[in-house]
């Protein structure tokens, strides 16, 4: 049996229904069997877990996703073995295997792989700060969302009106969410906002920086 699946990965927003397309061509016999299984990201195919079987004219959802899986066409004997997965969770991200068996059609292995990513908006990020906050010193502002798929990008902005910082005194890394402030001055003091963004949305946190004279302690 030759199985056809999309070559590009599938992305589905959190809570929506994913349709994992799988089609095939074979003269369906009574021994026809379909199995859908799931592998977590980074795990080998050998560690797949069955989530649905079809055999002897009957459908058998199985495992932790059993209440949320069904077939687009039941019975899946018309050449369409597409899986529907409702109310997708972040833990549904991974590789799905569509395997069709139909003896004596052994021309190919009857296996198709689909990568599913569940799209999750960024969670409210945590803003933190470390380093010397005295005049002339350097500090790092950090921002990180515990959730978000694809991984959010981070952008720091300073709120309010303030003099333009000298070039190179503010360097940010959109991937790590870190903002490095060097050669601090009293005018560096203020509120900084980090916005975490992906295709599903954005979330933000704020942090107030107080730059002090070298003789004084650090106040955050």
């Amino acid at each position: 049996v030759e199985v056809k699946v999309p070559t590009e990965p599938l992305s589905t927003p959190l809570g929506k229904t994913a349709e994992l397309t799988c089609t095939y061509s074979t003269s369906v016999g009574d021994s026809f069997a379909l199995e859908w299984s799931f592998v977590q990201p980074g795990k080998p195919i050998s560690e797949s877990h069955p989530i649905l079987y079809f055999t002897n004219g009957h459908l058998y959802p199985t495992g932790s996703k059993s209440k949320r899986v069904s077939l687009l066409q039941n019975p899946p004997t018309v050449g369409v073995a597409t899986l529907k997965l409702t109310d997708v969770h972040p833990s549904d991200t991974g590789t799905y295997l569509c395997q069709v068996n139909n003896p004596p059609d052994f021309y190919t292995n009857g296996l198709g792989l689909i990568n599913l990513t569940v799209l999750v908006p960024p969670s409210n990020p945590l803003c933190s700060q470390s380093g010397q906050t005295s005049v002339g010193g350097s500090t790092a502002l950090r921002c990180s969302s515990s959730e978000g798929a694809p991984k959010p990008v981070y952008n720091w902005v300073r709120l309010g009106t303030f003099p333009t910082p000298s070039p190179g005194s503010m360097v940010q890394d959109e991937v790590s969410g870190q903002l490095i402030l060097t050669n601090l001055s009293l005018t560096s003091s203020g509120t900084y906002r980090c916005v975490a963004t992906n295709q599903m949305g954005s979330a933000s946190c704020e942090l107030t920086l107080s730059v002090t004279e070298p003789s004084q302690g650090r106040v955050a």
Partner: antibody, heavy 118, light 107 residues
Amino acid sequence: QVQLVESGGGLVKPGGSLRLSCAASGFTFSNSGMSWIRQAPGKGLEWVSSISDGGLYTHYPDSVKGRFTISRDNAKNSLYLQMNSLRAEDTAVYYCARQGVRPFFDYWGQGTLVTVSS
Amino acid sequence: DIQMTQSPSTLSASVGDRVTITCRASENIYSYLAWYQQKPGKAPKLLIYNAETLPEGVPSRFSGSGSGTEFTLTISSLQPDDFATYYCQHHYVIPWTFGQGTKVEIK
């Protein structure tokens, strides 16, 4: 050699019923998917039903679904098509055909003519 | 449903001619295409399946090519026995459908 011989065609009134048969020989019938395909006079070919090797799975196009029933008797090497609620547009030569491992049709019978007319 | 469209509907040719018939599918059918030859009053005969595979006994002057949505049947040197009607059929997902046919007649 493979032989498929259809029978049971004839003249029937609209709304009537007819049962076609196909006698198979020369191959292992019980291992083969089978189909019925029809051809209206002067027209092209239309697949009308299929059945799996042991009869568990049957399929139909929308044009005949609910009116036609395909069945088989592997002990008798026979394929059947029960046609109910016949319409004028069902008038055609009906062929029985064996399916390959993929659903193309590698052997055909000579056909039997069904005429639906008042 | 997948629609199959053949062109031309009729083709006039002479013995020895190279003949090409085209079949288009309304959506991707990969290589799941068969070709049949039918003579008047006779049942169709399988010529090609999987777009390009010839069953045993089919003369090598017949060849098939294509994948996706566009396919061709070629007769490299037309013989007297080849004047007939030719049909394509997809063997992908149900319902399996045929093209409307191409009649190859003597010029």
